[in-house]
């Protein structure tokens, strides 16, 4: 009887993370009698809709069920059909359907209400379907990076469970780039938070913290590069838009319907002589730094110090990790690694962005021409946003962790967010049990 | 002051077309959704199109879908309706409405409406 | 589409006196209800939004209520300029009035 298998006793759990490009589904697991302890919780899978984001459907409700049926199908199959009827199923919904709130409330509650009736029909214990504020999505990410670290465990380690773990109970910075939006969150050293919409306050397994929070709208990648363009074609001659953001040989054609299709372009807006115009792209880094530059209103301050717009930014501090987007963009450049100085990664962004568009073709050949063309951009984007949008330094960048995943499951806001939902971060400290972190072993 | 003001109404033979246009003033037009809204004479309101204030949505009413066309302007301040295929019941008091906000929501009711424009289709 | 059903179709009240417009869906439509009030000659005037907001410049004695289904418009105490045809809106779907109920002095 000794080798016989005891029945897991295991719990799940699936976040829906409903971004402004596209919808991903996230199954986490853990002992169903470890829930309070910190690091017990980690992923079992990643299912990637197939589609656009959900704000897209818009005109299209109808679609919503057929769009989330492979992904909701593959969580059947994967957790056991035992534990259906008691798995919480929560969707978040981020920037995209923020702007699409802003253009109509109706519009974006009728897209949730179609996603909320979809994930009903399915045997798990469906938690509704709600857009998220910036300030959550910044705040479940610095708990789910921080989760993973093992920085709410008050016990020492002599062992290090990540590369860049510095076994000390300083918490790591979040910085989260998406689609339409961007986060940065982090304790402040002794700072005031001068402005109350940023501040958060949490006791979390008996301790507190004094967090800093932003979200950006509109500064995501995808909604940046919306704002570039608007922003440039207004001084266009004609319908060619010489940009060097994109490689020299690249040639798009955008519809000028197209660009001013989300509230992110509107202070760029203006009445054009044509209704489509060409990008032709010449590939130079700097030119391309210096036209994002101009995205950031720095001229405007009422605090001590900003970011950008006059939004406060407390002088940063310690280690930061820099996920999503941040480390997407970043690992396709094979920019992620802890060596790579600031100097280093200008540099080799200024020979990716100068290379010919067909030889970048060859090169990547496997990868949609439709991403494989934005990384010129999204690359200087993130050094502009990081450098100049939050005064990160040459010396500061070495405390830029670029991850992916911590333990096998992927930095972003969902965990953060299903471990509140679920209440499985006391406040205070629970009572330490023999072995209850012998799942770090 | 918000100030709608409708025109290019008239008289018209079934079968033919008029584009009708409302100037907007008194707000930052482009930042509102924008809506045609119909009254025949001795009748109720009757919801015409909607254009979202960033193009997102554009719907129609299914008693003028495929015929009528709503268009916007933001750097005149314009809406336009374009009607083709005009029809008797098409006869009415077409208003030019915007849309309201829920705070800084945008929202699908009417806050502001213009005096109309008659359109009448007779032969 | 979703229709609205106002009831009554005209109501006969006298000066002073509370009045109560009512207005049904034919399906759910949550909390996107909205009133107007429309006298001879005029444009439509938004009086409600989303059920019981207070329009910008509207009096107090108007009031909203209701969600779901079921709506109501109440004038607590009426005044002669709130003789006219009062109608409800609905922005859950594509938007729909009901047919307008004629609010005429007694």
């Known amino acids: 009887t000794q080798n016989k298998a005891l029945p897991e006793n295991v719990k799940y759990g699936i976040v829906l993370d409903a971004g402004s490009s596209h919808t991903s589904l996230y199954i986490y697991k853990w002992p169903a009698e470890k829930e309070n302890d910190t690091g017990v919780v980690h992923q079992v899978e990643e299912c990637r809709v197939k589609g656009p984001g959900i704000s897209k459907f818009v005109q299209k409700v109808n679609e919503i069920g057929i769009y989330l049926t492979d992904c909701m199908e593959r969580a059947r199959e994967v957790i056991p059909r035992s534990q259906h009827q008691e798995t919480p199923v929560y969707l978040g919904a981020t920037a995209g359907m923020r702007l699409l709130r802003m253009e109509s409330e109706e519009l974006a509650d009728r897209v949730l209400d179609v996603v909320e009736r979809s994930l009903s029909n399915y045997p798990f214990d469906f938690q509704g379907a709600r857009i998220i504020t910036g300030q959550e999505e910044g705040a479940y990410g610095w708990i789910t990076i921080n989760y993973l670290l093992g920085k709410f465990s008050q016990k020492t380690r002599w062992f290090s469970i990540v590369p860049y773990e510095t076994n000390n109970q300083e918490t790591f910075g979040a910085l989260d780039l998406g689609g339409a939006s961007t986060q940065v969150t982090f304790v402040p050293q002794n700072q005031t938070i001068e402005s109350p919409d940023n501040a958060l306050q949490f006791r979390l397994y008996g301790k507190d913290y004094n967090v800093y929070t932003h979200s950006f709208l509109c500064y995501g990648k995808d909604q940046a590069l919306w704002q570039k363009l608007a922003k440039d074609i207004q001084v266009a001659s004609n319908e060619i838009l010489r940009d060097p953001c994109f490689h020299p040989g690249y040639k798009k054609v955008v519809n000028v319907s197209d660009l001013y299709k989300t509230p992110c372009t509107k202070r760029f807006e203006m009445t054009l002589p044509f209704q489509q115009f060409e990008i032709q792209g010449i590939g130079n880094y700097q030119q391309c730094h210096q036209s994002i530059l101009e995205l950031f209103n720095t001229s405007y301050c009422p605090y001590s110090q900003c970011a950008f717009n006059g939004i406060f930014l407390p002088p940063l501090q310690g280690d930061f990790g820099a996920f999503s987007a941040f480390y997407f963009v970043m690992k396709f450049l094979n920019l992620t690694s802890e060596k790579v100085s600031q100097e280093k990664v200008t540099e080799m962004m200024k020979k990716f962005c100068a290379q010919p568009w067909e030889e970048i073709k060859t090169s990547y050949a496997g990868v949609k021409e439709k991403y494989l063309s934005e990384y010129c951009f999204s690359g200087t984007y993130i050094l502009s946003l990081l450098l100049q949008g939050y005064h990160f330094t040459a010396d500061s960048w070495e405390h830029i962790h670029f991850i992916g995943k911590i333990q096998g499951s992927d930095a972003g806001w969902t965990l953060g967010y299903m471990l509140n939902l679920t209440n499985m971060i006391p406040a205070e400290q629970p009572l330490s049990t023999p072995l209850s972190h012998s799942t770090y072993v | 002051e918000v100030q709608l003001v409708e025109s290019g109404g008239g008289l018209v033979q079934p079968g033919r077309s008029l584009r009708l246009s409302c100037a907007a003033s008194g707000f930052t037009f482009n930042n509102y959704g924008m809506n045609w809204v119909r009254q025949a004479p001795g009748k109720g309101l009757e919801w015409v199109s909607s254009?979202?204030?960033?193009?997102?949505?554009?719907s129609y009413a299914d008693t003028v879908k495929g015929r009528f066309t709503i268009s916007r302007d933001n750097a005149k301040n314009s809406l336009y309706l374009q009607m083709n295929s005009l029809r008797a019941e098409d006869t009415a008091l077409y208003y030019c409405?915007?849309?309201?906000?829920?705070?800084?929501?945008?929202?699908?009711?009417?806050?502001?409406w213009g005096q109309g424009t008659m359109v009448t289709v007779s032969s | 589409e979703i229709v609205m059903t106002q009831s009554p179709a005209t109501l006969s009240v006298s000066p002073g006196e509370r009045a109560t417009l009512s207005c049904r869906a034919s399906?759910?439509?949550?909390?996107?209800m909205h009133w107007y009030q429309q006298k001879p000659g005029q444009a439509p005037r938004l009086l409600i939004y989303k059920a019981s907001n207070l329009a910008s410049g509207i009096p107090a004695r108007f009031s909203g209520s209701g969600s779901g289904t079921e709506f109501t418009l109440t004038i607590s105490s009426l005044q002669s300029e709130d003789f006219a045809v009062y109608y409800c809106q609905q922005s859950w779907n594509d938007p729909t009035f009901g047919q307008g109920t004629k609010l005429e002095l007694k």
């Open positions: 399906e759910g439509v949550k909390s996107y």
């Open positions: 254009f979202s204030s960033s193009s997102t949505y554009i």
């Open positions: 409405a915007r849309h309201g906000r829920y705070g800084g929501y945008g929202g699908f009711y009417f806050d502001y």
